[in-house]
């Protein structure tokens, strides 16, 4: 029988007293087959999150700070619930750490150094820790004592909590810098009368401060928010604008073996009898013998955390830099504005061998990081353990709801000034064999499909998508008969035609023969009756263009495209016969490596892009036999975004709202991820 | 297919050198660029170093100011000076040369270097 207790760990003993009251009356409402609590005491959070590393219990709930502490090794926990506060139909589980200015200051963030700063408090999230943590490597050295340093990076502050004799300047604009709400100062709403005030020039506080602290839009509209990319933006754009992302509170497991499945049900159990407003006799969010035991006082209830996310993606990217730089204290030497390499993420053992001579080439410009899928990559991007890599749109969208950026984007066409002119976008089409002269759009029921990868745009989001419109469900594995679909789930039928050997099978990269633009078409010629490919997929692969054995032969008259009127046209014909418009491929990367990325990609496409003429003895960035490896074959340039610099505006509102409406089909455990930290 | 074959290998002591050689059968080597990769047990395979054909070199961190690459075209040989070797130095080393364009699975036999006391 399989054990279903979950061991709760306590810090004291008003705690250990609620946990034990908690046991009971869970054991009163749940069947004797379903999850129970158990308690156990330990004398602080480290030792709680010890013991659940040591398997001696199983969860506790951390503020942020400790959610860090947890996911550091040896611990290796993650987050598996969150609380959320705010009501069930609006669920908050972050709140935003943010700077807030006066409109007419005129300074951007790189600019803070000399300014007055008001606090919330010494050793507090928003108001300190995050601030301080990603200003850290601007400090002035030694930045041992922080405070010390903080004091003579700014003019004046007030730091409530801060030791006044030491570090008058940290009590300048708060004489006394006394650590209650005596300080008028102090906290979140003190933070801000400090600015309001005019006492200080910046206030480091959370997005709720403002709003609850002016009930007037006029009177918020004087006030601004310091972006990380130095811009500013106005106060409820915090979204886009802040400086860290900060869960409220979490509970974590163990990473292994970490039961989350049967946390989850204990607590989702445990909210439907205990939560807000349910049960007299046990209330799960309220605390008569002390504050916030076991679960915050003021949450409304539980949240799922999406089993992808990991701690790193959950704390997101900016709040670990912080409490990276304050705990280790370690910058880099001498900060410059020369751009540190580009860690470029490559898929599989194919693109890894591009990107190596590439980042041989590049005399160190450019690194190589390697993932098995694109969503990995993705995510090593998001948390900084690569930098940037060039994606289908489909991805692009991916990117986008996890904060990334595009930056540059792949061009198809010769034209002279290339760089200047990012295009249209290129057609998705559906290819088939001419010799199957009954095929057509409205017959492909029962027939053999062939994908690029799923969540790509040709292969997948755009035939997909048209198809959920007529079949209104996401069974697309039911209504073809087989497929290679690669990124599906291996025992699917649209893993069936697939030609990747043992582990290979189906996966979304280069081992699996069926891969890609390439690939899918691959599939068609060997074993289906349609492919969702791009318009340049034929002509690239026959008349001897393609050496490879399965194509060398191939004429480019023997295949058709299915049009949406559910006629048939030759291949040359795709700007009449087509499935839609897809958007180029893009460079992403993270915003606060954008400019780099910008700068250093168009240095090395002057170098090695489509002006090199002999690719049999030079490195040319844009070629790889076919085989679209790092960036699609026929690139001719990577181009300037102007305008179009987020996803949104990238791919267009009709493609993203294409890709929106599949989202109901998603498997994608990143886009949950993703979600889940901004919905 | 250009035929590799790594020489050179051997056991020796931390902080000694060994200079690992790297002999291409094929017109291609004068104009290709080049690399040393190593593939340590239950580890990775991995850039150690690469020359361009210009002669520009490259090396992953671990390993600059210790590790030299080089070339003699005219002998179609490529070269791994490794000086004050570690520990963590010990793997198969294997030399490619990219001519066939990254999605090959061909790698030669490589030769062994074992650094230990």
């Known amino acids: 029988v399989p054990d279903k207790t979950v061991r709760w760990c306590a810090v004291s003993e008003h705690e250990a007293t609620k946990c034990q009251s908690f046991r009971d009356h869970m054991k009163s409402v749940i069947p004797s087959d379903g999850p129970s609590v158990a308690c156990v005491k330990k004398a602080s959070y480290l030792d709680c999150i010890r013991a659940i590393a040591a398997n001696e219990a199983d969860a506790v709930t951390l503020d942020a700070g400790l959610v860090y502490d947890a996911y550091l090794a040896p611990n290796n926990l993650k987050p598996v619930v969150a609380e959320f506060y705010g009501s069930k139909e609006d669920p908050q589980t972050f709140y935003y750490a943010v700077a807030v200015v006066k409109k007419d200051s005129g300074f951007q963030m790189n600019q803070l150094r000399g300014k007055k700063s008001c606090h919330t408090g010494l050793g507090r999230s928003a108001g300190w820790n995050i601030p301080i943590g990603l200003l850290y490597c601007d400090l002035p050295e030694p930045r041992k004592p922080l405070e010390k340093a903080v004091a003579n990076f700014f003019s004046g502050s007030c730091a409530p909590c801060a030791d006044g004799t030491d570090f008058p300047q940290l009590c300048q604009l708060c004489p006394g810098c006394g650590c209650s709400t005596l300080n008028q100062y102090f906290g979140y709403s003190g933070a801000f009368k400090c600015l309001k005030d005019g006492a200080g020039d910046v206030a480091f506080v959370k997005h709720s401060t403002i709003f609850e602290n002016l009930a007037n839009k006029a009177d918020r509209d004087q006030y601004e928010l310091l972006c990380l990319d130095n811009t500013r933006k106005p106060v409820d754009e915090y979204k886009d604008c802040h400086l860290a992302q900060v869960p409220s509170h979490t509970v974590v497991a163990r990473s292994m073996g970490g039961k989350e499945d049967l946390i989850w049900e204990l607590l989702n159990q445990a909210q439907e009898h205990f939560g807000k407003d349910k049960s007299k006799e046990f209330q799960l969010f309220s605390s008569p013998h002390g504050k916030d035991l076991l679960f915050k006082d003021s949450a409304h209830g539980f949240l799922k955390v999406p089993p992808r996310m990991d701690a790193k993606m959950y704390l997101g990217y900016e709040y670990v830099t912080a409490i990276r730089n304050l705990r280790e204290g370690t910058c880099p030497e001498a900060p410059t504005d020369e751009c540190k390499p580009v860690k470029w993420c490559a898929l599989s053992h194919h693109e890894r061998l591009k990107c190596d001579e590439w980042s041989v080439n590049s005399v160190g410009k450019i690194e190589c990081v390697s993932a098995e899928t694109t969503e990995d990559c993705i995510a090593k991007i998001m948390n900084g353990e690569a930098d940037a890599m060039s994606l289908d749109g489909g991805f692009v969208y991916i990117a986008g709801k996890c904060g990334l950026v595009p930056v540059l984007a792949e061009n198809y066409n010769k034209s002279d000034n290339c760089e200047d002119t990012p295009e249209a976008g290129y057609f998705a089409i559906a290819v088939v064999k001419k010799s199957a002269s009954d095929l057509t759009w409205d017959n492909l029921k029962g027939k053999k499909s062939c994908h690029t990868a799923v969540g790509r745009t040709a292969g997948w989001n755009i035939p997909m998508g048209l198809l959920y419109n007529k079949i209104n469900h996401c069974r697309f594995d039911e209504f073809f008969s087989e497929g290679c679909a690669p990124g599906s789930k291996k025992d699917s039928s649209l893993c069936k035609l697939c030609m990747g050997s043992g582990l290979n099978l189906c996966e979304p990269n280069n081992k699996e023969g069926y891969y890609g633009y390439t690939g899918a078409f691959r599939c068609l010629v060997e074993k289906g009756d349609v492919a969702f490919v791009k318009h340049q997929t034929v002509p690239q692969n026959t008349g001897g263009k393609n050496p490879d054995p399965w194509a060398k032969n191939l004429n480019e008259k023997d295949y058709e495209l299915l049009c949406l009127d559910g006629t048939r046209k030759p291949v040359e014909e795709y700007a009449n016969c087509h499935l839609a418009r897809a958007p180029n491929h893009a460079v992403v990367t993270r915003k606060d490596k954008e400019a780099c990325v910008h700068k250093i990609l168009r240095q090395q496409q002057h170098l090695f892009g489509s002006n090199v003429t002999d690719c049999s003895g030079n490195f040319c960035l844009f070629r790889s036999e076919t085989k679209d490896l790092l960036f699609r074959d026929d690139t001719v340039c990577l181009a300037k975004l102007h305008d179009r610099n987020t996803y949104e505006k990238y791919l267009g509102e009709e493609y993203v709202k294409a890709v929106g409406n599949l989202r109901k089909c998603s498997t994608s455990s990143l886009l949950e991820a993703c979600t889940f930290r901004r919905p | 297919q250009v035929q590799l074959v790594e020489s050179g290998g051997g056991l020796v002591q931390p902080g000694g050198s060994l200079r690992l050689s790297c002999a291409a059968s094929?017109?291609?080597?004068?104009?290709?660029?080049m690399a040393w990769y190593r593939q340590a047990p239950g580890k990775q395979r991995e850039l150690v170093a690469g020359i361009t054909r210009s002669g520009s070199t490259n090396y992953r961190d671990s390993v600059k100011g210790r590790f030299t690459i080089s070339r003699d075209n005219a002998k179609n040989t490529m070269y791994l000076q490794m000086n004050s070797l570690k520990p963590e130095d010990t793997a198969v080393y294997y030399c490619?040369?990219?001519?066939?364009?990254?999605?090959?699975?061909?790698w030669g036999q490589g030769t062994q270097v074992t650094v230990s006391s």
């Open positions: 094929g017109s291609i080597f004068s104009i290709a660029t």
């Open positions: 490619t040369d990219y001519s066939s364009r990254y999605y090959h699975d061909y």
